[in-house]
């Protein structure tokens, strides 16, 4: 058993049918010695008496808020949560496996640049009685500080007969050095509590691996005289690291017909302009990627040919 926060404790339960459970000793936080009784949640049934209460925690029915009283007065509370292990594996019931980039991916993180700021998000089908707490550091043995805000509900969507909720959190490395080679990964730890269930989720990554630039901005077309060709130009997104001479992007320019089946013409360039043939009813899209490290491409920025 360990303390998650003041008066909230997590019991680690290796569960299987007929498991003996965990013996837990609760101590009433009071100088009083006599006349102390214990109850669980809203029940008035007295579970025991004395300054300590010994319970056998076998299942969620044994978890909840234990209260010690004396003469009708509440002395202290202890909320017991369960962290359940089955077949040697800690439960992961609260969050949805996003399965990208691989199975058992519960947390996904992205950074728009090398400033040390990043966003992580996760999915759940649970709508109520749910709390998250996020901690982060660079490295784990001699951790360097990363400050994370509060997790917030960022999106809701319907998937079949299921409603899915997306939560996200923003974190900032306290002493980020954008140009430095990373040797220690960022560690992100999410504590999730749903009703009386505790779970924890972790992710470990280098900022360079989670970079996803914003789309190029100010995408414009300039028709070339007496030609079906146009000059496409764009700019680096505002959120990208500077100077651009050091933090350089490469770009992919795509001409896409109205029909998805039509052949796409693609051009790759390190410049912020390109010359392409603009077909009728087509659109031109540009996306960006770090020039020197193959992290994610940005989303597309698009303009119609007409």
């Amino acid at each position: 058993i360990w303390e998650l926060k003041k008066d909230v404790y997590v019991v680690e339960l290796d569960w299987y049918p007929d498991a003996p459970g965990e013996m837990v000793v609760l101590t009433c936080d009071t100088p009083e010695e006599d006349g102390i009784t214990w109850t669980l949640d809203q029940s008035s049934e007295v579970l025991g008496s004395g300054k300590t209460l010994t319970i056998q925690v076998k299942e969620f029915g044994d978890a909840g808020q234990y209260t010690c009283h004396k003469g009708g007065e509440v002395l202290s509370h202890s909320l017991l949560l369960l962290h359940k292990k089955e077949d040697g594996i800690w439960s992961t019931d609260i969050l949805k496996d996003q399965k990208e980039p691989k199975n058992k991916t519960f947390l996904r993180c992205e950074a728009k640049n090398y400033s040390g700021r990043f966003t992580c998000w996760w999915l759940t089908t649970i709508s109520t009685d749910l709390t998250f707490s996020v901690k982060s550091s660079r490295g784990s043995s001699d951790p360097q500080g990363v400050t994370c805000g509060a997790a917030t509900l960022s999106a809701e969507r319907v998937r079949g007969d299921n409603k899915e909720y997306e939560y996200s959190v923003e974190c900032q490395e306290d002493s980020a050095c954008p140009a430095a080679e990373e040797s220690l990964p960022i560690e992100v730890m999410v504590d999730a509590v749903h009703k009386l269930k505790y779970e924890n989720y972790t992710s470990s990554f280098f900022i360079r691996d989670i970079i996803k630039p914003d789309p190029p901005k100010n995408l414009q077309l300039k028709p070339l005289k007496n030609s079906r060709q146009v000059e496409v130009s764009w700019e680096y997104p505002d959120t990208w690291s500077t100077p651009h001479s050091y933090f350089s992007l490469t770009f992919c320019v795509q001409v896409q017909g109205k029909s998805k089946r039509e052949k796409k013409d693609r051009v790759f360039t390190d410049k912020t302009s390109a010359t392409v043939i603009c077909r009728k009813n087509a659109s031109i899209s540009v996306r960006a990627q770090d020039r020197y490290y193959s992290s994610s491409w940005s989303e597309w920025a698009s303009v119609p040919c007409s």
Epitope: W15, G61, T125
Partner: nanobody, 123 residues
Framework: EVQLVESGGGVVQAGETLRLSCAAS????????MGWFRQAPGTEREFVGT????????YYTDSVKGRFSISRDNAKNTMYLQMSSLKPEDTAVYYC????????????????WGQGTQVTVSS
């Protein structure tokens, strides 16, 4: 929201078998841990057993172990209670319930309840 409807109850002789079904509609059935409870006249609602969302683990009260078996078919949105070697003391209204905590024998850990189906075991 999940709506639950029990069926399969009836009158049987002691020692016989009966299979109860619990059909779910509404939100995704496979998200929920499911349980069976029963209530005899003049008594509190009593835990029978529970099954986890994947159907890979079950947990029973001592009095039904070895006689009752819970299973589920997530493709059919249905949970089952196979009852064998029935005794007169198994006579009760049987309720199915859906919740988020497995295992739990406590009724208030379940969020959704069916209306119940009567099982009567005569000697």
């Amino acid at each position: 929201e999940v709506q639950l409807v029990e069926s399969g109850g009836g009158v049987v002789q002691a020692g016989e078998t009966l299979r109860l079904s619990c059909a779910a509609s509404g939100r995704s059935f496979s998200n929920y841990e499911m349980g069976w409870f029963r209530q005899a006249p003049g008594t509190e609602r009593e835990f029978v057993g529970t099954i986890n969302r994947r159907g890979s683990s079950t947990y029973y009260t001592d009095s039904v172990k070895g006689r009752f078996s819970i299973s589920r078919d997530n493709a059919k949105n249905t949970m089952y209670l196979q009852m064998s070697s029935l005794k007169p003391e198994d006579t009760a209204v049987y309720y199915c319930a859906a919740g988020w905590l497995f295992p739990s024998s406590r009724s208030r850990d379940y969020d959704y309840w069916g209306q119940g189906t009567q099982v009567t075991v005569s000697s």
